[in-house]
Interface confidence: low
């Protein structure tokens, strides 16, 4: 009956971690004697090719300085300890500890048997490194030029992580890759870039990092922070301001980052009705008169700049009962 070597075509191990390279001689054959088990790296320089050996009487040996005896062990193989115990070499699984990038490559497990001769199997060891991911917003001020508003960094991955962004904004990503501090690893940085405006402030975008060491992609939310001048609108005008009306108010509605530092009410005509009193973001009208036939301007400032809005007021002689309640902007 023929015997064969059962190995995995590919094994993945974490950089710095421990990996097992399975190797079994199958099936169990009565009378088959295993005289030696060896692990070799056929692609390595000559003095590094013989990685490990297990002799039925002498036990394990690790002739190559790389990986070396301090990082190698046989998981299950047992040597004969006397006349009463047989060596157990059918399972030649090899463990590598403290994986390095240099450990990546082909490994050949070979059984020297009597009377069947030598049989072997080959495994490709891939060394991967699980990256550390982080994402953060960059505090930016509005401008007309595309600016990096968020960074997503996948640090020291092997192979390099794939970074993408999930967002409804109009954006583009700029990616750079540099060698990690751990040999053989790559740090990937993706810059989420857009023309920063108030529309982007406070919006949460998501950095998606994919890597074969993850069961699922890592999703990292980032809340954008864009400093922008006030975006102003005026509310409160209902197209039904009439002479003598006393309950009228205009409100200056603002979106800004940072918060407004000042509000200023004025008119385009330069004349400001005495019965209109500015109270911060509100303009309270005690009594509407003909001077209110004008355009009111609210100017708002913050640390970035200023914004303004205008509201044209039409003063009626008498209340408009038909269209009352319609709002104007």
């Amino acid at each position: 009956q023929d015997v064969r070597v059962q190995v995995l075509p590919e094994v993945r191990g974490q950089l710095g971690g421990t990996v097992e390279l399975p190797c079994h001689l199958l099936p169990p054959v009565p009378g088959l004697y295993i005289s030696l088990v060896t692990w070799q790296r056929p692609d390595a320089p000559a003095n590094h090719q013989n990685v490990a050996a297990f002799h039925p009487k002498m036990g394990p040996s690790f002739p190559s300085p790389k990986p070396g005896s301090e990082r190698l062990s046989f998981v299950s193989a047992k040597q004969s300890t006397g006349q009463d115990t047989e060596a157990e070499l059918q399972d030649a699984t090899l463990a590598l500890h403290g994986l390095t990038v240099e450990d990546e490559g082909n490994y050949t497990c070979e059984f020297a048997t009597f009377p069947k001769g030598s049989v072997r199997g080959m495994t490709w060891l891939r060394v991967i490194a699980k990256p550390k991911n982080q994402a953060e917003a960059q505090k930016v001020t509005f401008s007309q030029d595309p600016t990096t508003v968020a960074l997503c960094i996948s640090k020291e991955g092997r192979p390099p992580a794939r970074i993408s962004w999930l967002s409804s904004l109009d954006w583009e990503a700029k990616e750079t890759q540099v060698s990690g501090t751990l040999a053989g690893t790559v740090t990937v940085t993706s810059r989420f870039t857009l023309v920063p405006s108030g529309r982007a402030d406070g919006v949460t975008v998501t950095c998606k990092v994919e890597h074969e060491s993850f069961e699922e992609p890592a999703l990292i939310p980032v809340t954008l922070s864009v400093r922008y001048p006030p975006e102003v609108s005026i509310s409160g005008y209902d197209d039904n301001w009439y002479l003598g009306r006393t309950d009228a108010t205009l409100s200056c509605d603002v979106r800004s980052n940072p918060e407004p530092t000042g509000y200023d009410w004025s008119t385009t005509s330069g004349t400001f009705p005495t019965s209109a009193v500015a109270q911060g973001s509100q303009l309270v009208i005690h009594a509407v008169d003909s001077l209110f036939n004008t355009t009111f301007v609210c100017t708002v400032t913050n640390a970035v700049g200023m914004g303004r809005a205008e509201q044209v007021i039409f003063v009626r002689e008498t209340p408009n009962t038909a269209g009352a309640g319609a709002t104007g902007g």
Partner: antibody
């Protein structure tokens, strides 16, 4: 100054649901990942769970089913679904500054005593 | 979920250097953090991302990692450093997320 404060800790009987609330001042709570951590008298710190700024919630394996974390725009809540005497501890809420950095701001803690 | 092991207590003479260790049972590819907690107070973040110090933390506190061990070093211990110290790390593998604290080390400053 930025600060966190927990509230809702009190003496409860076993099995009585209890909700703890974490309130922030000086920063926008909704922009941060927030964690709950507890410490039994004379014992070490024990992580309960975290809620991300996007609303994703993760629990310690031992805490699943025993606690529920939720948030509004201004608070983060920890509901103890059916407390036992082993849940007697000081409960802290903590701000998780950014992904994989650490908890850079902690509340003073609120004491929950579960006793019959 | 991995386990972080810290010595239960460590003593140091005033002004001397002391190192507190934190060993993971499996090699962590995540960052270590260190927290200081004084009696009756909330913990305070001392070290993040293995080696970084938040503003306000004295530079006598430093962090390092080697293999699966994180170390907090206090270069010249002061009486005010007497406290419990906790290491912590996170595991973001797959769909789960866990944050793990070590059991804590009680530091006593003598002299």
């Amino acid at each position: 100054a930025q600060s966190l404060e927990e509230s809702g800790g009190r003496l409860v009987t076993p099995g009585t649901p209890l909700t703890l609330t974490c309130t922030a001042s000086g920063f926008t709570l909704s922009s941060y990942h927030m964690s709950w951590v507890r410490q039994a008298p004379g014992k070490g710190l024990e992580w309960i769970g975290i809620i991300s700024s996007g609303g994703s919630i993760y629990y310690a394996s031992w805490a699943k089913g025993r606690f529920t974390i939720s948030r509004t725009s201004t608070t983060v809540d920890l509901k103890m679904t059916s407390p036992t005497t082993e849940d007697t501890a000081t409960y802290f809420c903590a701000r998780y500054a950014a992904y994989s950095i650490g908890m850079d701001l902690w509340g003073p803690g609120t004491l929950v005593t579960v006793s019959s | 979920q991995f386990v972080l092991t810290q010595p239960a207590s460590v003593q140091v003479n005033l002004g001397q250097m002391v190192s507190l260790t934190c060993t993971a049972d499996t090699l962590s590819r995540s960052y270590a953090s260190w927290y200081q907690q004084k009696p009756g107070q909330a913990p305070v973040l001392l070290i993040y991302r293995d080696t970084s110090r938040p503003s306000g933390v004295p530079d006598r506190f430093s962090g390092s990692t080697s293999g699966n061990t994180a170390t907090l070093t206090i270069s010249g211990a002061q009486a005010g450093d007497e406290a419990d110290y906790y290491c912590a790390t996170d595991d973001n593998s797959g769909s789960s997320y866990q944050y793990v604290f070590g059991g804590g080390t009680q530091l006593t400053v003598t002299g």
